[in-house]
Interface confidence: low
């Protein structure tokens, strides 16, 4: 039959070459002369010329040594043709399998492997995996089967067998207890990979195991007792810096300190923060301390870490005795902001109120008073009694100084301490309206035609508050009523001015008296420009030579 079984050829053959491998034979050679040829990669296509065939005998020839790691299998086709070139057989598949020899050593994928494991872990904890490769065959032979081993460990503390490596996977694990970062922060392992499943060629590499920090050391106060002095009333004042030592890795959560005031801060006066660089505890005042109430505080501060302890550890406690120093304190107005109702326009010299301060200090200090801010200069304050008196006319309608009926004054109290201290208070005078403003019309200039004149509507305003405002009443005076009429509308907030007799083109004064609900009267002169025109006008038409 025109078939050939797969041919096995070992790699790295010594020859001599060409080397006969197998004979192709067609049974058609009984009838006619047959010529043999081969095609395919390794024959007539790259890599060309590795194989050849004796044309007339059909012997398959190997022309040079093979390398399994380069090409492990060749697939060729055998051809048989008669003398006239006609094909006598279908092309035949020829498989040439290159068999492996152990011609490669294992190779680690890295010269140095790096891994890490927490200190104090239990035996059996996986650390890292190393890998070596071998180009030889590991399926049909052991040539490429790698076995891993640890050759040496440095340092050999606490002993020389702290780690093990899985023979076939390369996984490095902890085999003994006693990993302590504070004693040995790093191990260097020399590892081996051997082919033939441990009986062949060997290569080495280094595995560096970093021992990671666990919070297995508590921070300790050094010293444990402190004395500090703080002036009373100081807020945000640094009282004391507390120092700790911690054997864990600097600047890690296992080293960074967390401080807690465990006792002694009954009034919630203190706070403690951690300095980001030094790790010190910075004790500061959250609120002012009061010498008169308590002149000494004893605080108990406990320190732990940002990270929880991995095992039960005793915590360190510091004692801080804080001595409060007496300070001359500022007088305090009672209340800090005082509202007083007072009628506007009260006579000069009239008392407005008494506004006094108390001194927190225990000594009987003398307090003197003065006005600190009185925008309109309306008030005076007795330096001894704190009595506030009107020295100017309080005017509710003064928009410059009065907002929403309130006139705001700031007063100052000063004690006779050494040095003297001052406190301020706010006096809010609610000014009660009196009927001190008459109604005023707007606008005060009008332009009107002397024929079919349009009624002029004037708005009435009164700076006072109700009931000292509308309804308003209007009256024309000084003979203005001969030519004009003035009527207040139903709502009582506008006045309608009408020209009732013909006037020649000119400018006239209309004397209008308006009075409010409280009969406060205000006389206003309206400047009326009369024009020669009909109906509505804004400016007189034509040349205008009026006054």
């Amino acid at each position: 039959d025109w078939v050939v079984a797969p041919i096995s050829v070992p790699e790295n053959g010594k020859g001599p070459f060409p080397q006969r491998l197998n004979q192709l034979k067609s049974n058609k050679d009984r009838d006619t002369k047959i010529f043999y040829s081969i095609t395919g990669p390794g024959a007539d296509s790259p890599p060309e010329g590795v194989f050849a065939v004796e044309k007339e005998t059909g012997w398959l020839l190997l022309n040079k040594p093979l390398d399994r790691e380069e090409i492990a299998k060749y697939e060729l086709f055998g051809h048989a043709v008669s003398e006239n070139g006609a094909s006598v057989e279908d092309p035949m598949n020829i498989s040439i399998i290159v068999t492996d020899q152990n011609d490669h050593k294992p190779k680690f994928t890295q010269d140095t492997f790096r891994g890490s494991v927490l200190e104090g872990v239990l035996p059996g904890t996986s650390v890292m995996q190393v890998t070596a490769t071998d180009e030889d065959d590991a399926i049909y032979t052991y040539n490429g089967v790698v076995a891993y081993s640890i050759h040496s460990q440095e340092p050999k503390d606490p002993h020389d067998l702290m780690f093990t490596i899985h023979r076939s996977t390369g996984t490095i694990s902890v085999i003994s207890s006693g990993l302590d970062r504070e004693k040995v922060p790093e191990y260097t392992l020399t590892i081996q990979a051997t082919d033939m499943d441990g009986d062949g060629s060997t290569t080495t590499a280094v595995a560096v195991v970093e021992i990671l920090d666990a919070n297995d050391n508590a921070p300790m106060f050094d010293p444990q007792k402190y004395e500090a002095h703080v002036p009373e009333n100081a807020v945000g004042h640094e009282v004391q810096r507390l120092t700790v030592t911690d054997l864990d890795a600097p600047n890690s959560p296992a080293w960074r300190a967390t401080y807690l005031i465990m006792g002694g801060d009954d009034g919630d006066h203190f706070t403690i923060t951690t300095h980001p660089e030094s790790n010190q505890g910075i004790l500061t005042t959250r609120k002012g301390l009061d010498f008169e109430a308590k002149n000494q505080h004893t605080l108990y501060v406990e320190v732990t870490n940002e990270a929880p302890f991995v095992l039960k550890l005793p915590t360190s406690t510091a004692t801080i005795v804080v001595h409060v120093e007496d300070v001359n304190e500022a007088p305090v107005f009672v209340p800090p902001s005082k509202v007083v109702e007072v009628q506007e326009g009260i006579p000069t010299g009239e008392p407005v109120c008494v506004y006094t301060a108390e001194d927190p200090d225990k000594e009987n200090q003398k307090i003197s008073y003065r006005i600190l801010r009185d925008p309109a200069g309306w008030l005076a304050m007795d330096p001894d009694s704190g009595q506030v008196t009107a020295v100017g006319t309080l005017d509710r309608e003064d928009e410059q100084f009065v907002r929403n009926n309130i006139y705001e004054v700031m007063v100052l109290a000063m004690d006779n301490g050494s040095p003297p201290t001052t406190g301020t208070g706010t006096l809010l005078l609610t000014l009660i309206d009196v009927n001190d403003h008459g109604p005023v019309p707007e606008p005060r200039q009008i332009t009107i035609c002397n024929q079919s004149p349009v009624r002029q509507v004037l708005n009435i305003t009164d700076k006072d508050l109700s009931p000292h405002t509308s309804p308003f009443q209007a009256q024309l005076t000084d003979d203005s009523d001969i030519y004009w009429t003035a009527e207040v509308n139903e709502e009582g907030d506008t006045v309608v001015l009408s020209l009732k007799k013909f006037l020649k083109q000119d400018t006239y004064d209309v004397h209008l008296s308006l009075s409010d609900h409280g009969n406060k009267e205000q006389l206003t002169v309206i400047r009326a420009t009369v024009c020669d025109c009909h109906g509505h006008v804004e400016t007189c038409p034509g040349p205008w030579k009026g006054g």
Partner: antibody
């Protein structure tokens, strides 16, 4: 003597915020209102607003509402102004100024903080 | 808002001259007018408040006058140290507004 010490020059990117300070000394900080004024390059002065350090009450120029935020820290006698959503239009010198009593105008001024807004 | 107008943006004068800088308000500001001096280095000082009152420490050669909408600042005897930009400011109504400034230079 009365002094208003403003913070140093600022270079910031558009869209960012900036907070400048004005430290007062030589007088009772809470007794006087603190005003802020803007001066764009080669231009006149624009009033931003003021804060009463005693009460914390703030009055803004409508033009600067939402742009400027005024605060004070009484313990350090310092006034602050924060400007947000910055654009090149905000590049200017900003002054803090103390308001005198009664009709006294702005009787003492800081040296000014130069703000440059640029990408 | 009240507009403050300083019509003269720059002014040249000789040392010893009497110099007047004017300022106009868009409405009556009832004497609530202040004058400020800004030196070339940016330093700002109050000179005059409430139209004519001299701020403490300001030389008496500076004076102010005016009423209603028209105000002026006068330097009676110009000195080298007076080279600056002068701003008027109204304190009558919110928002407080400033004039455009008058830059004073030496001839």
């Amino acid at each position: 003597q009365v002094q208003l010490q403003e913070s140093g020059p600022e270079l910031v990117k558009p869209g960012a915020s900036v907070k400048m300070s004005c430290k007062a000394s030589g007088y009772s900080f809470t007794a006087y209102n603190m005003h802020w004024v803007k001066q764009s390059h080669g231009k006149s002065l624009e009033w931003i607003g003021f804060i009463d350090p005693y009460s914390g009450i703030i009055t803004y120029n409508q033009t600067f509402k939402g742009k400027a935020t005024l605060t004070v820290d009484k313990s350090s006698s310092t006034a602050y102004m924060q400007l947000n959503s910055l654009t090149s239009e905000d590049s200017a010198v900003y002054y803090c100024a103390r308001r005198g009593y009664y009709d006294g105008g702005f009787d003492y001024w800081g040296q000014g903080t130069t703000l440059t807004v640029s990408s | 808002d009240i507009q403050m107008t300083q019509t003269t943006s720059s002014l040249s004068a000789s040392l010893g001259d009497r110099v007047t800088i004017s300022c106009r308000a868009s409405q009556d500001i009832t004497n609530y007018l202040n004058w400020y001096q800004q030196k070339p280095d940016g330093t700002v000082k109050l000179l005059i408040y409430y139209t004519s009152r001299l701020h403490s420490g300001v030389p008496s050669r500076f004076s102010g006058s005016g009423s209603g909408t028209d105000y002026s600042l006068t330097i009676s005897n110009l000195e080298q140290e007076d080279i600056a930009t002068y701003f008027c400011q109204q304190d009558s109504k919110h928002p407080r507004t400033f004039g455009g400034g008058t830059k004073l230079e030496i001839k």
